[in-house]
């Protein structure tokens, strides 16, 4: 995604098919308020951003409303009237689903079913990662609805769980982002726990697709 025009690096994230965030890192213009101009249609005039992101008091990005659009975003980052980076990108390639909401756990002997609210669009994978203090790494299971059953658990062990959503590469391509993880929740004997003893701090979310 990043461009190298005049040393400008860009990142696009399409949050949950609702909001597009374009951020830039332009070392040459680090103390400059660059402006962001955009359009969703090649025929239209450019609009200027009305919702800038700031870093150390200077513009570093723009947030745009783009509810359920399958469009190309045409944009120009400018220093005054001089374009320092101009590009066009298909927004949905950079989809980042929202984090799972209303995560619930239903236990039955040595199995747990993890459910959450399905997002309003499809072609997603709902991934549950879990581990006990005796596991060296996280185990993972995913399904294409938020209804994931994990079997073969030890009822006496305490398990930590978290959930995220990923866009299917077959549909959206390889450049999407996984959602943020849900909060970690800990369970033992079918009951929620504050923590699992001896559980190391959960690793940062893996950014692999």
């Amino acid at each position: 995604q990043g461009g190298a025009a005049e040393g400008v690096q860009i990142q696009i994230i399409y949050f949950n098919l609702e909001t597009v965030q374009v951020t830039w890192n332009a070392s040459k213009y680090s103390r400059t308020n660059l402006t962001f101009h955009y359009r969703f249609n090649g025929d239209e005039a450019y609009d200027q951003c009305t919702n800038y992101l700031l870093q150390e008091g200077h513009t570093s990005g723009c947030l745009l409303d783009a509810e359920q659009r399958d469009d190309i975003l045409y944009f120009s980052i400018r220093n005054g009237t001089h374009p320092v980076f101009t590009a066009s990108r298909w927004m949905v390639y950079y989809l980042k689903p929202s984090s799972p909401k209303h995560v619930r756990f239903s236990w039955h002997q040595d199995a747990v079913t993890v459910t959450c609210s399905d997002l309003s669009y499809g072609d997603l994978l709902y991934e549950v990662q879990y581990r006990s203090p005796f596991d060296t790494e996280w185990q993972s299971k995913q399904e294409n609805t938020c209804n994931v059953t994990i079997e073969g658990l030890d009822a006496e062990k305490c398990y930590s769980f978290w959930v995220r959503v990923k866009a299917m590469e077959d549909v959206y391509g390889p450049d999407t982002y996984p959602s943020d993880w849900s909060e970690v929740t800990c369970w033992q004997r079918g009951e929620i726990r504050d923590a699992c003893a001896e559980t190391p701090t959960p690793p940062k979310p893996k950014l692999s697709k």
Epitope: Q68, R69, D70, I72, S88, R89, W90, Y93, Y121, G122, D123, M168, E169, D170, V171, Y172, G173, P174, D175
Partner: antibody, heavy 118, light 106 residues
Framework: QVQLQESGPGLVKPSETLSLTCAVS?????????WGWIRQPPGKGLEWIGR???????SYNPSLKRRVTISVDTSKNQFSLKLSSVTATDTAVYYC???????????WGQGTLVTVSS | EIVLTQSPATLSLSPGERATLSCRAS??????LAWYQQKPGQAPRLLIY???NRATGIPARFSGSGSGTDFTLTISSLEPEDFAVYYC????????FGGGTKVDIK
Amino acid sequence: QVQLQESGPGLVKPSETLSLTCAVSGYSISSGYYWGWIRQPPGKGLEWIGRIYHSGTTSYNPSLKRRVTISVDTSKNQFSLKLSSVTATDTAVYYCARNWGGNWFDPWGQGTLVTVSS
Amino acid sequence: EIVLTQSPATLSLSPGERATLSCRASQSVSSYLAWYQQKPGQAPRLLIYDASNRATGIPARFSGSGSGTDFTLTISSLEPEDFAVYYCQQRSTWLTFGGGTKVDIK
């Protein structure tokens, strides 16, 4: 496996509307993917027309946008193309295809020739 | 619109020879490029996607390379069934195809 089949009139008069349907078998459209239309004038190259998601969200080739409508009928597991105000330059083999991996086409229907002539 | 220019327009080769097809984009398309094969009276078939990944069921003699504006499809040793027209396609901004390269028997 997924199979697609185009159907519709093979002959359309100038200034009228071309209408085609793509029936999908082996996969439920409502389960996902984007679905697209491409055309190929006789002896020439390929031109993308547009695509649709099962929710009805569409995207069209800017050069055809004012004349194209793509719709989906999940109950019949099919999607359709309408191209208005046709001229002889719209004569082509029209293909439907599944969009895959972001925006590649695989698989394709076998194509249907539409001739625009009075 | 991103224009894809394919060369040569026609490539005349014999079975067993190596075929090298070129596709040049009018601006960078990163690795967002695919190759298709089309035989007379048939629909195109996806061969290579994202510049270098072979689609399911495509023989290893087909390979793709390149990024940015210059891309190559290589057929290491032509089989009789490989004589066809080959198209490149980009998905960076909208979707456009090249004009095609015809590989025919010398």
